[in-house]
């Protein structure tokens, strides 16, 4: 491991040894919520480190996290979801660092799924639809979605469209003819709850029709 900077700077920020970040997922398993935390510094020796959450809990004062490999995880119904909780990194009984966090401000939605694209020949467009488990939830129901698409050959030239519904229409004339496209979607809380983007959905691939030379229009596949 020669040449590896054990005490080098973190790329984005100067962080103390025990800086950590967390996200919550509400009603992720029936009525159970989850909270996941991890250290930001990949060099932290986590062998004897534990996480604990206290405050803004129902029926209990504190809860301990389970360590899953190199993350820390709780699944429970006991989050009050009103006010701030205190999340601490502990070694034995000693707290090394703590953060006061309102769990409703660090919500990471579940990834959208069932993404598909249907070509409408008469309308000369593509209808993009997808699903989200949040339509059935009590808490985090309102999301903003980010649909990203690109021509498969263009490594990093993504076009992004933000929308609040789960349906989007892409005009055929805005896309290249006879090209393979990749499309994916992610979600973020958009009303009352705050937080982070979900993971991306699995990608969906579709091909645009050829141009019909006589009319200048695309042929369906």
């Amino acid at each position: 491991e020669s040449g590896y900077a054990q005490n080098g700077d973190l790329e984005d920020a100067e962080l103390d040894d025990y800086s950590f970040s967390c996200y919550s997922q509400l009603e992720v398993n029936g009525s159970q919520h989850s909270l996941t935390c991890a250290f930001e510094d990949p060099d932290v020796n986590i062998t004897n480190l534990e996480f604990e959450i206290c405050g803004a809990l129902v029926e209990v004062k504190c809860l301990n996290f389970r360590k899953l490999q190199e993350i820390y995880f709780i699944e429970t119904k006991k989050f009050l979801l009103i006010g701030k909780s205190n999340i601490c990194v502990k070694v034995g009984e000693k707290s090394l660092t703590c953060k006061k966090i309102d769990l409703t401000t660090i919500v990471k939605p579940e990834a959208p799924f069932d993404l598909s694209v249907v070509y409408r020949e008469g309308a000369n467009d593509f209808v993009v639809t997808f699903n989200t488990s949040h339509l059935q939830k009590k808490y985090v129901k309102v999301l903003m979605h980010d649909v990203a698409y690109r021509q498969e050959k263009d490594e990093n030239k993504w076009t992004h469209v933000n929308l609040s519904s789960t349906k989007l229409t892409l005009l055929q004339r805005k896309l290249q003819p006879a090209a393979m496209y990749e499309i994916k979607v992610r979600s973020i809380p958009d009303h009352y709850f705050k937080g982070f983007w979900s993971e991306w959905s699995p990608s969906y691939y579709f091909r645009t029709p050829e141009i019909n030379n006589s009319s200048g229009e695309m042929d369906p596949i």
Partner: nanobody, 117 residues
């Protein structure tokens, strides 16, 4: 069974760029600190860059700092290494693996990066 498949290497001139990818399977990728390592002929594995489980913290070897960028996509179990301003000394076989290796962990086949004019 843990599987790590690296790709994206090649022959590049000094000052050029490459983007390495690693497809991981057989373990819970999103729960692990991940790293890129490299091995030059006749040398030990050298730790090049590491990234936290959420991707919000990174570390780099002094020799690559400011030139290489590690990133990850937990939805796709993918690890990446963007390599810019490549130098002759970057020539090596590049491997991805866990930062904290388990006793049973093997290495993938790696991807060869050759910097030559």
């Amino acid at each position: 069974q843990v599987q790590l498949v690296e790709s994206g290497g090649g022959l590049v001139q000094p000052g050029g760029s490459l983007r390495l990818s690693c497809a991981a399977s057989g373990f819970t990728f999103s729960q692990r600190i991940m790293s890129w390592y490299r091995q030059a002929p006749g040398k030990e594995h050298e730790l090049v860059a590491s990234i936290s489980p959420f991707g919000d913290g990174t570390r780099y070897a002094d020799s690559v700092k400011g030139r290489f960028t590690i990133s990850r996509d937990n939805a796709r179990n993918q690890l990446y290494l963007q390599m810019n301003s490549l130098e002759f000394e970057d020539t090596a076989v590049y491997y991805c693996n866990k930062r904290n290796l388990d006793v049973s962990d093997d290495w993938g086949q790696g991807t060869q990066v050759t910097v030559s004019s």
